[in-house]
């Protein structure tokens, strides 16, 4: 069973001092931040017992294994059902505490009732403040039964539940009609899934015979021991004021466990601590009684004395629950109450015994749960004891259960039962997860869900190149850390598998399913440098670069050009997808902008080192287009252009540029500068006769401006082929004067 205890402090004079504490003795309990241990939860359960809302309760965590609920302001805050949930996975367990108001009309004679399947349960509500109305019994908040107030017997209302079955379990209440629900008596009924003394799926297995009020768990056959007792059969008493499955916890405060109610996992329920009784667990046991709720009687023999916490304290020469066994009778010594082995191992189990006459090898035997008897293979005889060693055949799951070591001599016999847990080594249910990859390493998360039993002690990661027959490489890692597989080959698929281990011999589980993880391409190592660049317009830049010459093939898929506009905080990236390219035209840039430019080689998704940066200033955008451009043929080789200056100029024009192109021609256009910006007319000379030309022009201030409209004109016929167009310009007025 899960080592989980819910403690209720029942010093009820002041509700503000009331607290509930949930304590877990489980390894790693309550950490909650990792995959191996969900947190402890402690809360009031309002589904069945609803009380008036009050201020929210305060939850405080004390370390990883303890959580406390405080902040109760009035007695009614306490009434109802509280639950603590702890343990991980299939072991997740809920412990329930039911609190009754001490001032209620009806009070339970006993709050927790644990009964076996098929038993008759009797719930008894004692009249504390009488009302002459019906008494309504409810089960889990729903109507169950009605009693007339005359039906009280000796001041008690009884609810008989014959032949109870597990679904009958739950919270029961008895309430006077017309009374507040806070005046109810609340009970908890726990129905074990098996008849008395049995456990297991078909209730075929025999319980170990739990001592000192321990209750046999119907699922796993373990004894859930009352607070203050430990051992497989609860045979051992803890020191006063201690509790927990290994007596590892201590009651808070100077008065020990007085005034505390202890609730343990079902089917135990709740009780006072060992040595205490009463509705508020504040009364010490009467002489001759001991244990939780003082339910046990000592009946010590041979001069033994009764201790209310542990039972009979025997004088020397005697032992046993009632000091009924003489020390001459053989006695099993120091047998562990619980042993754990891994499936399919062949462990050695030791059993030591003493007595008079002295036990010999053949007088000690080991009995398995299926009744098979093993004889010892060797014995070590020492002055005070004989230790027999048993070689156990290969363990199977059915070997889980209670084993027994038995010693028999002419002086009598003794036996000690102990629990053997056969654990299944863990097997991953999923493949590991790739977190990041580089060309020569993979970062892997090995944490995966698994079948079988924990805890996980080690994680092995096995890996090798895909389709390889070479041996697997193995790395052993901490369960909670990510793993880096190093010194791998670039651009290579690796098969990766996880193997989990639990503690103990044979704890290694089978390998989990494989997954394919591929390393990245090799990083490009060459650093380009910028050869040069020139501006081809206010928004166009031609860039060229080079790479160092190295032997072998080029490692790269292309180039990335980056332009950084520091003023606007914007980056422009241009992908050149050929590794042979050494030049690129960048268009759509912002005129008048200062750019920082660099280039780097890329391969797959990896970037090589960037070139040293260059700083480029694009000219600002130029002036508007000239207006009313007009062309007029003057001869077979001359055409005159006239225009009007652009409007709204941002500054003085430095020149005009005229573009001349043969209509329908395939060649590049010719650009001719008009260097006297004040002119509004120019003559283009050296043209071919009878040829149709296209003209457009633009102005320049610091940068070139927008083109004007395009005009067409043909030279006059029958002239000779000219050398090529040239320009002569005058002010328009001057031309008109001539």
């Amino acid at each position: 069973a899960v080592d989980l205890t819910l403690l209720a402090n029942l010093r009820l004079t002041d509700p503000q001092r009331f607290f509930l504490t949930c304590v877990s003795g489980e390894a790693g309990a309550g950490r909650g931040s990792d995959a191996w241990g969900p947190p402890l939860l402690l809360e009031k359960d309002d589904r069945i017992v609803r009380t008036p809302p009050g201020p929210p309760l305060r939850l405080a965590r004390n370390g990883s294994h303890q959580v406390t609920l405080r902040g109760f302001s009035k007695p009614s805050d306490l009434v109802g059902v509280f639950s603590c949930v702890g343990g991980a996975g299939a072991r997740r367990t809920r412990v329930i505490y039911v609190h009754n108001s001490p001032g209620a009309h009806l009070l339970p004679d006993k709050v927790t009732h644990t009964v076996n399947k098929g038993d008759t349960a009797v719930l008894s509500a004692r009249v504390h403040k009488e009302k002459q109305t019906d008494v309504i019994w409810k089960s889990n908040g729903s109507y169950f039964y009605t009693l007339d107030w005359h039906e009280a017997q000796d001041g008690r209302f009884l609810l008989q539940l014959p032949n109870v079955q597990p679904p009958s379990s739950g919270i029961y209440s008895a309430t006077y009609l017309e009374a507040s629900p806070l005046g109810s008596a609340f009970f908890r009924l726990i129905v074990r899934g098996c008849g008395a003394g049995r456990w297991g799926p078909g209730c075929t297995k025999e319980c170990p015979g739990c001592l000192h009020g321990g209750v046999c768990h119907d699922h796993d056959g373990e004894c859930v021991c009352p607070p203050g007792f430990t051992g497989t059969r609860c045979e051992q008493a803890c020191r006063e004021g201690r509790f927990g499955q290994s007596c590892q916890e201590q009651c808070p405060g100077i008065s020990g466990c007085r005034g505390l109610t202890f609730c343990l996992p079902d089917p135990y329920g709740c009780s006072c601590g060992s040595g205490w009784r009463g509705s508020q667990c504040q009364e010490a046991c009467a002489p001759g009684h001991f244990g939780a709720d003082c339910r046990l009687q000592c009946q010590c023999q041979n001069g033994g004395t009764c201790d209310r916490f542990s039972g009979c304290v025997c004088p020397s020469g005697w032992h046993g629950v009632h000091c009924e066994k003489s020390d001459r009778i053989p006695q099993i010594l120091n047998m562990a109450s619980e042993l754990e082995f891994n499936l399919e191992t062949m462990p050695r189990i030791n059993c030591a015994a003493a007595g008079n006459p002295f036990p010999v090898r053949g007088s000690i035997e080991l009995r398995k749960p299926d009744g098979t008897v093993l004889l010892s293979t060797k014995a070590i005889v020492e002055p005070e004891k004989t230790t027999a060693e048993f070689e156990v055949p290969r363990l199977v799951l059915a070997d889980s259960g209670f084993w027994e070591c038995r010693v028999s001599t002419s002086g009598g016999q003794d036996s000690r039962r102990f629990k053997v847990n056969v654990k299944v080594p863990p097997v991953p249910l999923a493949a590991p997860r790739l977190l990041t990859k580089q060309s020569r390493q993979l970062v892997v998360s090995p944490l995966v869900s698994f079948s079988g039993d924990g805890p996980i002690s080690t994680v092995r990661l096995h890996y090798r190149p895909q389709d390889s027959t070479m041996d697997w490489s193995t790395i052993v890692v901490d369960p909670s850390e990510n793993v880096t597989l190093m010194n791998l080959r670039p651009k290579t698929g690796y098969s990766v598998r996880v193997q989990l281990s639990r503690p103990g011999e044979g704890g290694e589980g089978a390998w989990g399913p494989p997954t394919l993880m591929t390393t990245d391409c090799p990083e490009p190592l060459l650093q380009p440098w910028l050869e040069g660049w020139h501006v081809e317009g206010t928004d166009r830049l031609r860039v060229s670069w080079s790479l160092p010459l190295v032997p072998g093939p080029l490692v790269g898929d292309g180039f990335l050009l980056r332009l950084w506009d520091g003023t606007r905080g914007q980056e422009r990236r241009e992908n050149v997808s050929s590794p042979q390219a050494r030049t690129a035209l960048l268009t759509g840039l912002t005129p008048g902008t200062h750019y920082q430019l660099d280039v780097q080689l890329y391969h797959c998704t990896l970037l090589g080192p960037a070139s040293p940066p260059a700083h480029v200033l694009l000219p600002p955008s130029g002036p508007p287009a000239p207006r009313h451009l007009h062309a007029q043929a003057l001869s077979d080789s001359e055409i005159q252009l006239t225009w009007k200056h652009p409007e709204a100029l941002p500054g003085p024009i430095s020149k005009y540029v005229v573009e001349v192109q043969v209509a329908g021609g395939a060649g590049d256009p010719l650009w001719i500068d008009v260097d006297r910006p004040e002119e509004t007319s120019t003559i283009i000379r050296g043209l071919n006769a009878s040829t149709r030309y296209l003209f457009r022009m633009r102005a320049s201030i610091q940068g070139l401006g927008d083109w004007s409209n395009t005009v067409e004109e043909s030279t006059l016929g029958n002239g000779l082929q000219a050398e090529g167009p040239v320009q002569e310009s005058r002010a328009a007025e001057e031309g008109l004067d001539q």
Epitope: I136, Y143, T146
Partner: antibody, heavy 121, light 107 residues
């Protein structure tokens, strides 16, 4: 499905006797209070008697006290009303009904949630 | 015994009307009051318990209110199937007395 089925009604002379039965099904009969309620022709409803689940405590309207006896057989899921010394004013349709209790605003309230179809006496 | 008095004894109303029936107890009964509907030749049917809690399956046009000695059953919009006799009943003490009934007829 909860069902209550009365039987045993009929014509009887004043001073005569009659035993009504109410067969219950669809619920755990032994856990509920059971009631007899009657309705004279053209009149309103009149509470007659109640019996607790255990069969112990019983109560009667003053008009029938000493003449009528309510009883139950939990093993047969049946409620009975033995009527002796019948009078003309006992003429009515007799209904059996189940007593239920439900919580509302924290308190428990009783009511009659299922009724039989009635039998005429 | 606690006497329960309903008013009116009968009323005529049309479909869609809002109808109110009152019930008065001869002594305080807190909220221990139930309302039943009965149609001719049929058994009574529980509508409301605890003065104002609607029994499951009962249309929401039925509502109850009141506490102490004075209680009301309201039908917000009368439907053709609502023409019946309505009874209040106290469940505060034994005997569990009923009101004399209110017959709701078609106008």
């Amino acid at each position: 499905e909860v069902q209550l089925l009365e039987s045993g009604g009929g014509l009887v002379q004043p001073g005569g006797s009659l035993r009504l039965s109410c067969a219950a099904s669809g619920f755990t009969f032994s856990r509920y209070k059971m009631f007899w309620v009657r309705q004279a022709p053209g009149k309103g409803l009149e509470w007659v008697s109640v019996i607790y689940p255990s069969g112990g405590p019983t109560m009667y309207a003053d008009s029938v006290k000493g003449r009528f006896t309510i009883s139950r057989d939990n093993s047969k899921n049946t409620l009975y009303l033995q009527m002796n010394s019948l009078r003309a004013e006992d003429t009515a349709v007799y209904y059996c009904a189940r007593g239920m209790v439900r919580g509302y605003s924290g308190y428990d309230y009783p009511f009659l949630d299922y009724w039989g179809q009635g039998t005429l006496v | 015994d606690i006497q329960m008095t309903q008013s009116p004894s009968s009323l005529s109303a049309s479909v869609g009307d809002r109808v109110t029936i009152t019930c008065r107890a001869s002594q305080t009964i807190s909220s221990y009051l139930n309302w039943y509907q009965q149609k001719p030749g049929k058994a009574p049917k529980l509508l409301i318990y605890a003065a104002s809690s609607l029994q499951s399956g009962v249309p929401s046009r039925f509502s109850g209110s009141g506490s102490g000695t004075d209680f009301t059953l309201t039908i917000s919009s009368l439907q053709p199937e609502d023409f019946a006799t309505y009874y209040c009943q106290q469940s505060y003490s034994t005997p569990r007395t009923f009101g004399q009934g209110t017959k709701v007829e078609i106008k």
